[in-house]
Interface confidence: low
C-alpha cells in the first residue's frame, strides 16, 4: 500500500515527515529516499522531541488509528549476521544514512541476542498515554517486514530531510494564504521554518476572486548561510487593517502612518533586515552563526566574532563549523582504531583483548584457558587464535572443527581390520569370531575351535593388536550364550575370513551375545555392518556388550 504525508515539522536544518501506511522497513526507506531523505534518525533527546512532534501532528489527523499501540519505522537497523553489542547505546544497530554510534537511546525493553536475521527499529507510541514531552516514544526492535506483508502492527514511518539552511515563514500584513511547496514534495500552509529551495505561493485577499493577488517566492541562499525569500516589506498589506492584522506582518514593531500605511521597526539592540520585516540582533553571535557544536565568542567591542570548537573537534574551512579530528591518523592504537565524534577508541582484532603494557594495547586471548575452551578434547592456544585436536581413535568434526567424532575402524579406508567380526567402540574397536571359531592370540584372526556351539568370541585381551593404545573406552567382557546357533559355518582355512554366504546354516537363527557377568541380564540385538562377516555391532559406551545379529530376512542391519 502507498503512504501519504500527513505531517511535517521543520526545525534547525532538517524537516521530519510522518506517514501512515503499512509498509516494510525497506519500502519505507525507499519512500523517503525517492524524495531525497532517509528514515529518520533519533540521535538526541532534542531530535526525539522533533520526531514526537511530527507524530503528534500525524495522530491528530489520523482518526482511523484504533490500535492502542502504534509503531513507526525509523532509520535504525542491524544487518543479518551482525550480532548484538550490549555495551553500545545503539546495541550494534546503525543509522541507515550512515554516521557514528550515537550516545542517545530509548529502548523499550532489553534486547535479545540474535544474529540470524536483519532487525529494524520502530518508535512505539502508546496511544492510551498523552504525547507529553516527558514521555518520548520508545524504541522497539523486531523483524523488518517484507514487501506486501510488513506486519499489521506497523502503522507508518518517519522520514528526515536535511538542508543547507532555512527561510523564516513569510509574514502576511493582511488577509491572505501562503502555500509552501518543499523540495521533498510536501505542501503546507504553516511551517516554523521553510527549507532552502522551497517555493511559496501567496494569495492575498479574503477569498473574493476579484481582489486576489498572487505572489511567488523561492527560498534562496542570499549569502553564505543566509537564506531569504527576496521579498521586500510585509505581504498582502491593506490600509483597511494597518498594523491591526498580524502586527502588520512585522517581526517586532509596527508603526502606522496617518494614511493607513505602516512600516516595520525593531526594538533597541536589533536592526531591520533587507526584507523590511525581520529584526536581527546587533550582537553578531545572536544569529548563532557557529554550527556543529561551535561556540560563538564575541570579539572586542562586540563588533565581530570567532567560533570555538570543543575538544576533539576543529574548525572547518568556513571557520563556522566544527568537524571531528581524526585521531586515528596518528595511529594511537596497537591494532584497530575507530574514530568517534570528538575522540577515538581502540579495538582489538578477533582473538585478542584489551590489555598489556601501554594505552590501546592488545593481548592474546587464551581460548584454551580453563572453563573457556571451545574444543571437545585437545586445545592448543596460538597467537590470536587456537586449534583443536582429538585423541587417537577420534577425528575433528563439526562446522567449526571443535568437536571430535569416533573413527569407525570397522569401515576404515584400508578395509576391515578384523578377519571375521569387527566391533566398533568409542575411540577403539575389537574383533570377534563366528560360532565354532575362536579368536587367535593376535586378536584379529579366527581359528577353528572345538566343535561346540559357542558364542562369537569376545574382545581381545589387553595386549592384543585390536585394542588401541591410550583408549579409555570400557572393554566388553566375553559372554557365554545360553544356546548357540543351529549350525556352524563351513570349514575354511584357519586364517581366512569366513563369508556369510546364503547357504550358511547360521541364517536360521540370530547370533546372540549375553551381557557380561555382573551386568543386568539384558539381551541386545546389534546389527552387522557389511555383507562380509568382517563387521559387527557397535559396542555402546559403558561396557554393555551388544549382540551380533543377522536379520531374519537375510538383510544386514544398519549401524
Amino acid at each position: 500500500t502507498g503512504a501519504d504525508t500527513e505531517a511535517v515539522v521543520c526545525v534547525g536544518t532538517a524537516c521530519y515527515t510522518a506517514h501512515s501506511g503499512k509498509l516494510s522497513a525497506a519500502e519505507a526507506q525507499n519512500h523517503c529516499n525517492q524524495n531525497g531523505g532517509n528514515l529518520a534518525t533519533v540521535k538526541s533527546k532534542e531530535e526525539a522531541q522533533h520526531v514526537q512532534r511530527v507524530l503528534a501532528q500525524l495522530l491528530r489527523r489520523e482518526a482511523a488509528l484504533t490500535a492502542r499501540m502504534s509503531k513507526f519505522w525509523i532509520g535504525l537497523q542491524r544487518e543479518k549476521g551482525k550480532c548484538l553489542d550490549p555495551s553500545l547505546p545503539l546495541k550494534g544497530f546503525s543509522w541507515v544514512g550512515g554516521g557514528e554510534d550515537t550516545p542517545y537511546s530509548n529502548w523499550h525493553k532489553e534486547l535479545r541476542n540474535s544474529c540470524i536475521s536483519k532487525r529494524c527499529v520502530s518508535l512505539l507510541l502508546d496511544l492510551s498515554q498523552p504525547l507529553l514531552p516527558s514521555r518520548l516514544p520508545k524504541w522497539s526492535e523486531g523483524p523488518c517486514g517484507s514487501p506486501g506483508s510488513p506486519g499489521s502492527n506497523i502503522e507508518g514511518f518517519v522520514c528526515k530531510f536535511s538542508f543547507k539552511g532555512m527561510c523564516r515563514p513569510l509574514a502576511l500584513g493582511g488577509p491572505g494564504q501562503v502555500t509552501y511547496t518543499t523540495p521533498f514534495q510536501t505542501t503546507s500552509s504553516s511551517l516554523e521554518a521553510v527549507p532552502f529551495a522551497s517555493a511559496a505561493n501567496v494569495a492575498c485577499g479574503e477569498g473574493d476572486k476579484d481582489e486576489t493577488q498572487s505572489h511567488y517566492f523561492l527560498c534562496k541562499e542570499k549569502a553564505p548561510d543566509v537564506f531569504d525569500w527576496g521579498s521586500s516589506g510585509p505581504l498582502c498589506v491593506s490600509p483597511k487593517y494597518g498594523c491591526n492584522f498580524n502586527n502588520g506582518g512585522c517581526h517586532q514593531d509596527c508603526f502606522e502612518g496617518g494614511d493607513g500605511s505602516f512600516l516595520c521597526g525593531c526594538r533597541p539592540g536589533f536592526r531591520l533586515l533587507d526584507d523590511l520585516v525581520t529584526c536581527a540582533s546587533r550582537n553578531p553571535c545572536s544569529s548563532s552563526p557557529c554550527r556543529g557544536g561551535a561556540t560563538c565568542v564575541l570579539g572586542p567591542h562586540g563588533k565581530n566574532y570567532t567560533c570555538r570548537c570543543p575538544q576533539g573537534y576543529q574548525l572547518d574551512s568556513s571557520q563556522l563549523d566544527c568537524v571531528d579530528v581524526d585521531e586515528c591518523q596518528d595511529s594511537p592504537c596497537a591494532q584497530e582504531c575507530v574514530n568517534t565524534p570528538g575522540g577515538f577508541r581502540c579495538e582489538c582484532w578477533v582473538g585478542y583483548e584489551p590489555g598489556g603494557p601501554g594505552e590501546g594495547a592488545c593481548q592474546d586471548v587464551d581460548e584454551c584457558a580453563l572453563g573457556r575452551s571451545p574444543c571437545a578434547q585437545g586445545c592448543t592456544n596460538t597467537d590470536g587464535s587456537f586449534h583443536c585436536s582429538c585423541e587417537e581413535g577420534y577425528v575433528l568434526a563439526g562446522e567449526d572443527g571443535t568437536q571430535c567424532q569416533d573413527v569407525d575402524e570397522c569401515v576404515g579406508p584400508g578395509g576391515p581390520l578384523c578377519d571375521s567380526l569387527c566391533f566398533n567402540t568409542q575411540g577403539s574397536f575389537h574383533c570377534g569370531c563366528l560360532p565354532g571359531w575362536v579368536l587367535a592370540p593376535n586378536g584379529v584372526s579366527c581359528t577353528m575351535g572345538p566343535v561346540s556351539l559357542g558364542p562369537p568370541s569376545g574382545p581381545p585381551d589387553e595386549e592384543d593388536k585390536g585394542e588401541k593404545e591410550g583408549s579409555t573406552v570400557p572393554r566388553a567382557a566375553t559372554a557365554s550364550p545360553t544356546r548357540g546357533p543351529e549350525g556352524t559355518p563351513k570349514a575354511t582355512p584357519t586364517t581366512s575370513r569366513p563369508s556369510l554366504s546364503s547357504d550358511a546354516p547360521i541364517t536360521s537363527a540370530p547370533l546372540k551375545m549375553l551381557a557380561p557377568s555382573g551386568s543386568p541380564g539384558v539381551w541386545r540385538e546389534p546389527s552387522i555392518h557389511h555383507a562380509t562377516a568382517a563387521s559387527g555391532p557397535q559396542e555402546p559406551a559403558g561396557g554393555d556388550s551388544s549382540v551380533a545379529t543377522q536379520n531374519n530376512d537375510g538383510t544386514d542391519g544398519q549401524k
Epitope: Q49, Q52, Q57, L132
Partner: antibody, heavy 120, light 111 residues
C-alpha cells in the same frame, strides 16, 4: 473570534450523573485538545482530563477514572463531560479549556464555566 | 503527581509597586531546554486567563508589566508595576506530566 460556550447551571442529587457541554467556535475544532477543569467554591483549580476531538482519544486524571466520560460531536463542534456517582464534593464550577495538540499544553482559551451543585 | 506550591498565599502591594509570586514544583518540569510551567490570572466570577506559558513567554495581548522567570523547580511571576485591574488570584500550572496540576493560588490585593 475563538469562543467556548458552556451549558447552563445544573442541580443534582447525590448518586446522580451530570452531563456538561462545551461548544467551540472560531477555530478548527479538531486541531486542539479540549480539557475539563473544575473549581470547588473558594478552592483552586483541578484538572479532570482531556479529549482529542479529532480521533476521540481521552485521557483522564486517575482521580476521576471510572466516573468521568468525555465525548465529542464533530458535526456540532461540541465536547461533553459526564460525571457520575455525584457527591457533595463534586459541587464546583466546571470549565472547558482548549490546548495545543503537543508539548506544552497550556490552556489559552477557557469557557465561562458551568456551575454544578450536588445537594440532597 | 507533581505538587505545585505557591507562595505567598496572599499579597498586598501598593499601586505602581512590584508584586512577586513564587511557585515551586515537587520535581523538575523542564524538558529539552523548555520549562512546562504556565501562569494564569483569575478575577472573581470569571474563568482563568492565560498570562505566561513556558515559564517566560508572554501570551498575546497580555501587558508587558507581567513577566515570568525560572526553570527546573523554581519559578516566579512578576508584575513590575501593579495596576488596579491586576487584582486577582494567580495560579501556576505544570504541563510536563499527567495529571496536569495547578498551584493553590496567590491572591493579589492593593495595599
Amino acid at each position: 473570534q475563538v469562543q467556548l460556550q458552556q451549558s447552563g447551571a445544573e442541580v443534582k442529587k447525590p448518586g446522580a450523573s451530570v452531563k456538561v457541554s462545551c461548544k467551540a467556535s472560531g477555530y478548527t475544532f479538531t486541531s486542539y485538545w479540549m480539557h475539563w477543569v473544575r473549581q470547588a467554591p473558594g478552592q483552586g483549580l483541578e484538572w479532570i482530563g482531556e479529549i482529542d476531538p479529532s480521533a476521540s482519544y481521552t485521557y483522564y486524571n486517575q482521580k476521576f477514572k471510572g466516573r468521568v466520560t468525555m465525548t465529542r460531536d464533530k458535526s456540532t463542534s461540541t465536547v461533553y463531560m459526564q460525571l457520575s456517582s455525584l457527591t457533595s464534593e463534586d459541587t464546583a464550577v466546571y470549565y472547558c479549556a482548549r490546548s495545543v495538540y503537543y508539548g506544552n499544553k497550556y490552556f489559552d482559551v477557557w469557557g465561562a464555566g458551568t456551575t454544578v451543585t450536588v445537594s440532597s | 503527581d507533581i505538587v505545585m506550591t505557591q507562595s505567598p498565599d496572599s499579597l498586598a502591594v501598593s499601586l505602581g509597586e512590584r508584586a512577586t509570586i513564587n511557585c515551586k514544583a515537587s520535581q523538575s518540569v523542564d524538558y529539552a531546554g523548555d520549562s512546562y510551567l504556565n501562569w494564569y490570572q483569575q478575577k472573581p466570577g470569571q474563568p482563568p486567563k492565560l498570562l505566561i506559558y513556558a515559564a517566560s513567554n508572554l501570551e498575546s495581548g497580555v501587558p508587558d508589566r507581567f513577566s515570568g522567570s525560572g526553570s527546573g523547580t523554581d519559578f516566579t511571576l512578576t508584575i513590575s508595576s501593579l495596576q488596579a485591574e491586576d487584582v486577582a488570584v494567580y495560579y501556576c500550572q505544570q504541563t510536563n506530566e499527567d495529571p496536569r496540576t495547578f498551584g493553590g493560588g496567590t491572591k493579589v490585593e492593593i495595599k
